[in-house]
């Protein structure tokens, strides 16, 4: 028996359902009584879901997995993972045994988009050219960790005096806070781009300082 899976990682958004595709080519006369199907975590060998002795043995993994029972006889051994969490990310191995056996691994990549950044300025009044200001760009509830880029009004990257920190909450999602310290010119726009490297999603925030008032 030959097992086939997608070579590309399956990308799933947090809280959505994902299908990890796995298939085999059944011989003529194949019946489910002959099938032993096991899904497990590749690295830890933890059992995720199994079909043995002619029946679905159910989920061994937080009761959020399911097979496609009506399609098994056609060779579809795919696994449905419901309400995806950050902790589900990783490699899953599909083992199929009929008379001989084969296995293949498929990667699940979890992602969550970042919120539109909020911008704060310190100090936020009585600003004059030559003043040192701290601009903070904050974006929330994304995964995996973000790349953060700062640019001035002309699109020139600002790389000096940038400190970026990531905070993971209980669900494993990141809040990113990036701080730019800059000396004010006569006026200027400072923009922050928060990029999710998996989704290639960019979230933008900017602040324009024109004497007074401030524009966010």
């Amino acid at each position: 028996v030959e097992v086939q899976v997608s070579e590309d990682p399956v990308v799933a958004l947090v809280d959505t359902d994902a299908t990890l595709r796995c298939s085999f080519s059944p011989e003529p006369g194949f019946s489910l009584a002959q099938l032993n199907l096991i899904w497990q975590l590749t690295d830890t060998k933890q059992l995720v879901h199994s079909f043995t002795e002619g029946r679905d043995q159910g989920s061994a993994y937080s009761n959020r997995t399911a097979l496609f029972p009506d399609l098994l006889v056609q060779g579809n051994a795919s696994l449905r993972l419901q309400r995806v969490r950050v902790t589900d990310e990783g490699s899953y191995t599909c083992f199929v045994s009929i008379q001989d056996f084969d296995s293949a691994a498929v990667s699940l990549q979890v992602a969550a988009p970042y919120s539109k950044p909020s911008m704060t300025l310190e100090p936020n009044k009585d600003l004059r050219p030559g003043n040192m200001v701290t601009i903070t760009c904050s974006s929330y509830q994304g995964y995996p960790e973000a790349e953060v880029f700062w640019k001035d009004g002309q699109g020139v990257p600002l790389t000096g005096n940038v400190t970026t920190s990531q905070m993971a909450n209980e669900r494993g999602l990141f809040d990113v806070h990036s701080v730019l310290r800059v000396v004010l010119g006569a006026n200027g726009t400072y923009s922050c781009l928060v990029r999710n490297p998996v989704l290639q999603q960019d979230a933008h925030g900017s602040v324009t300082i024109t004497g007074q008032p401030l524009t966010f």
């Epitope: 950050v86 990783g90 490699s91 960790e145 920190s165 990531q166 905070m167 993971a168």
Partner: antibody
Framework: DVQLVESGGGVVRPGESLRLSCAAS????????MNWVRQAPGEGLEWVSR?????????YYADSVKGRFTISRDNSKNTLYLQMNSLRAEDTAVYYC?????????????WGLGTLVTVSS | EIVLTQSPGNLSLSPGERATLSCRAS??????LGWYQQKPGQAPRLLIY???TRATGIPDRFSGSGSGTEFALTISSLQSEDFAVYYC??????????FGGGTKVEIK
């Protein structure tokens, strides 16, 4: 079994460079963030650097090494690297390679045995 | 940077006794805290993550508790192999990922 094996340590003079390697096995290397943690003789643990998983190449450094050290990984070789330039006496330590337990929780569930770097004139 | 302060610095106890180690964070780290054991000449070993979850293969005499800024590692009945240095580490707000200064548990 997960194994992390560091190499490349040695004795160098201040200002010189050294490249550490960490060969990983027993897990899907590309799926995990990796770190370097060091321990000066008789002292506590100090996190040095982290590189996130896959090929996204997002890196972080302790202030004490920023601009001098570069972390990188070769997922095809299951190997983590630390390029150390402009070494100082205070960089003398055992350098451990450590695997992040998950990509959102940066505890270190597996460690190598370490490689000793001595910076001395 | 979040600073972790461990106390006491040294703890002298006899085998069979209960050990309680403390770790205090300079600001809340939620439950994003780990505990490690290190013996002389060896690499650290993960004991606890998520403040209270035992790592794979860790005996149940080790338990972690706390959240926010106050954490504890308890060894219910010290075995000879438990005499070592213990470190806490936060992974809530980073970089940097920070460790406490360590508590040395030694035989009385």
């Amino acid at each position: 079994d997960v194994q992390l094996v560091e190499s490349g340590g040695g004795v160098v003079r201040p200002g010189e460079s050294l490249r550490l390697s960490c060969a990983a096995s027993g897990f899907t290397f590309s799926n995990y963030a990796m770190n370097w943690v060091r321990q000066a003789p008789g002292e506590g643990l100090e996190w040095v650097s982290r590189i996130n998983y896959k090929g996204y190449n997002i890196t972080y450094y302790a202030d004490s090494v920023k601009g001098r050290f570069t972390i990188s990984r070769d997922n095809s070789k299951n190997t983590l690297y630390l390029q150390m330039n402009s070494l100082r006496a205070e960089d003398t330590a055992v350098y451990y390679c450590a695997k992040s337990g998950s990509n959102s929780n940066n505890f270190f569930d597996y460690w190598g045995l370490g490689t000793l770097v001595t910076v001395s004139s | 940077e979040i600073v972790l302060t461990q106390s006491p610095g040294n703890l002298s106890l006899s085998p069979g006794e209960r050990a309680t180690l403390s770790c205090r964070a300079s600001q809340s780290v939620g439950s994003q805290l780990g505990w490690y054991q290190q013996k002389p000449g060896q690499a650290p070993r993960l004991l606890i993550y998520g403040a209270s979850t035992r790592a794979t293969g860790i005996p149940d005499r080790f338990s972690g508790s706390g959240s926010g800024t106050e954490f504890a590692l308890t060894i219910s009945s010290l075995q000879s192999e438990d005499f070592a240095v213990y470190y806490c580490q936060q992974y809530y707000d980073w970089p940097p990922l920070t460790f406490g200064g360590g508590t040395k548990v030694e035989i009385k």
